[in-house]
Amino acid sequence: SKAVGIDLGTTYSCVAHFANDRVDIIANDQGNRTTPSFVAFTDTERLIGDAAKNQAAMNPSNTVFDAKRLIGRNFNDPEVQADMKHFPFKLIDVDGKPQIQVEFKGETKNFTPEQISSMVLGKMKETAESYLGAKVNDAVVTVPAYFNDSQRQATKDAGTIAGLNVLRIINEPTAAAIAYGLDKKGKEEHVLIFDLGGGTFDVSLLSIEDGIFEVKATAGDTHLGGEDFDNRLVNHFIQEFKRKNKKDLSTNQRALRRLRTACERAKRTLSSSAQTSVEIDSLFEGIDFYTSITRARFEELCADLFRSTLDPVEKVLRDAKLDKSQVDEIVLVGGSTRIPKVQKLVTDYFNGKEPNRSINPDEAVAYGAAVQAAILTGDESSKTQDLLLLDVAPLSLGIETAGGVMTKLIPRNSTIPTKKSEIFSTYADNQPGVLIQVFEGERAKTKDNNLLGKFELSGIPPAPRGVPQIEVTFDVDSNGILNVSAVEKGTGKSNKITITNDKGRLSKEDIEKMVAEAEKFKEEDEKESQRIASKNQLESIAYSLKNTISEAGDKLEQADKDTVTKKAEETISWLDSNTTASKEEFDDKLKELQDIANPIMSKLYQAGGAPGGAAGGAPGGFPGGAPPAPEAEGPTVEEVD
């Protein structure tokens, strides 16, 4: 089986594979090198990627996107609450976590963000398998460097649900740095990766020398990206539409989706043009919306967001104890770095230093992830043999001590993996357990930080207060995920201590159930695509027969021509009124059609009237005869999936 790198993006995802000293970015079934991180549910099927995004306007309430803005977060997270206001799909609170509620095949279904992300990952897995012609089991999956523990763990779970062995979770800017520096030899360079994507923003500062990639500091915003710029445009045009037409289109989800798509397109155009027009026919209540926007106006609408990208830049320089003049290269990653104003802000901040443009901003992350996947699975390329990746934990980890104080155990920007042990004891005689509350964040008080989990140590042997010596080890692994273990030092009865880990993540049972459900969905998708293939084949052959007969001239008797034409038209008419029929029904109809048409088509064939045949051509009949001849020599039938 093969190993791949997957950039699981907020808006688009990308998959790559490293072999024979090079990385291949793998195109999907539509020929696109990035795939929309969209999943849609309809009455008959589940759609993922381009197909899902393309029908979003027709089916807004059941087309799910932005799972990355939900994954590993609590329902009451202020950012989830803010996002909810403009999501066309329904979010519900299940045990304090957000779930997406949709109508699928006539039933109401709830999905966790992990499940939605797993569907996107599954699509990337299939894309790679089609291209590589082999099973893909192993993957390195990327996350924003500033993702916290819960978000990382949830992303890893999404990979598991997709049937992947997640070799490693790596940080997006670090992966991009590999793409930039893989072929770099020579002196030490300080490289600043500025990664502004569809929904997240990271800045990492690395030193790269002789194959050693050492992250010095990282900062970012897990809720800033291209979608926020789209939102500004959408809101601007909603107001304009109100002014012009005295109507509020924001009440209509289909109109909003059409407007958002137009805004996304306009934003892209404004990266290369100073002005663009937006033209949407019958946008709302039959009103056409024709307008234009300039680059200057767009920059004004997003000014505060663009400016805010410099805060993490300053923070990483401060944390790395470097002056901006010591940065050798600035590497721009993520589609949103194509925005000229963003580029200008960065260039101006670095006193006119131009960013390095040697890597593709859409593909660099998947590229680096593929290199790391190759390393972790034993690829012996000379390009990877010298690579050493030293990444950091983005947030300080600590525990709550008396008075709600945040006592840091692992400071932010600590090289990972890392371990820290601390001795705890009891505060009451014969106390059977200790509650340890773990937080992540930089504030002095735990109430201002993020509660990562509560770890209950139970089974402590009876003893006076302060006597038990419980050594708790905090271990941040190479994925940036925290694991906690404990030993009762005083008595050596470590096996008596159990840790109840309440990190709010999916349980092993949940994941197993979701894996099984994912398999079921995959089988249903497969069934549906076979059903569509049978439908298309029947339709294709019916039309092809009709055309062939109409061009047969006097090579067939009129009665024969009428028989085939009548049956073909009858089939087409049946298809129109039975679009949801089963595969078996389509196959039966095809057999009926063949039984009538084959003997007559054989006559035509013998008369030399249909070389190559209508559908396979040789007397073998439909389908499965000889391969179709070139177009000039007679009609061919194309099977459409």
Epitope: D210, G211, Q372, L376, G378, E380, Q385, D386, L388
Partner: nanobody, 110 residues
Framework: QVQLVESGGGLVQPGGSLRLSCAAS????????LNWHRQAPGKQRELVAT??????RYADSVKDRFTISRDNEKNTVYLEMNSVKPEDTAVYYC?????WGQGTQVTVSS
């Protein structure tokens, strides 16, 4: 599957010497960069020494005192520690290809 097993740690007096070994398996040893890292109590994990195709490199704190070497026949990488100081007390980890050993404790104390 990549496996890295460190040995040779222990208690050593200041100014003394120690030789750490790391036996590796599961990958083409001779062609890959090999690394020694350490983590002292309450400190960050740091890269101490590394040996790649361009030869060895050392952290400033151990330059001229520690030597990293490899034996490709035995699939083993060594860290020769001389003139040790109390601040060299740490758990020493061997790493390669993104994988880590379990570590070996070195304590420098009189």
């Amino acid at each position: 599957q990549v496996q890295l097993v460190e040995s040779g740690g222990g208690l050593v007096q200041p100014g003394g010497s120690l030789r750490l070994s790391c036996a590796a398996s599961g990958f083409d040893f001779s062609r890959n960069r090999l690394n020694w890292h350490r983590q002292a109590p309450g400190k960050q994990r740091e890269l101490v020494a590394t040996i790649g195709s361009n030869g060895p490199r050392y952290a400033d704190s151990v330059k001229d005192r520690f030597t990293i070497s490899r034996d490709n026949e035995k699939n083993t990488v060594y860290l020769e520690m001389n003139s040790v100081k109390p601040e060299d007390t740490a758990v020493y980890y061997c790493a390669a290809r993104g994988y880590w050993g379990q570590g070996t404790q070195v304590t420098v104390s009189s």
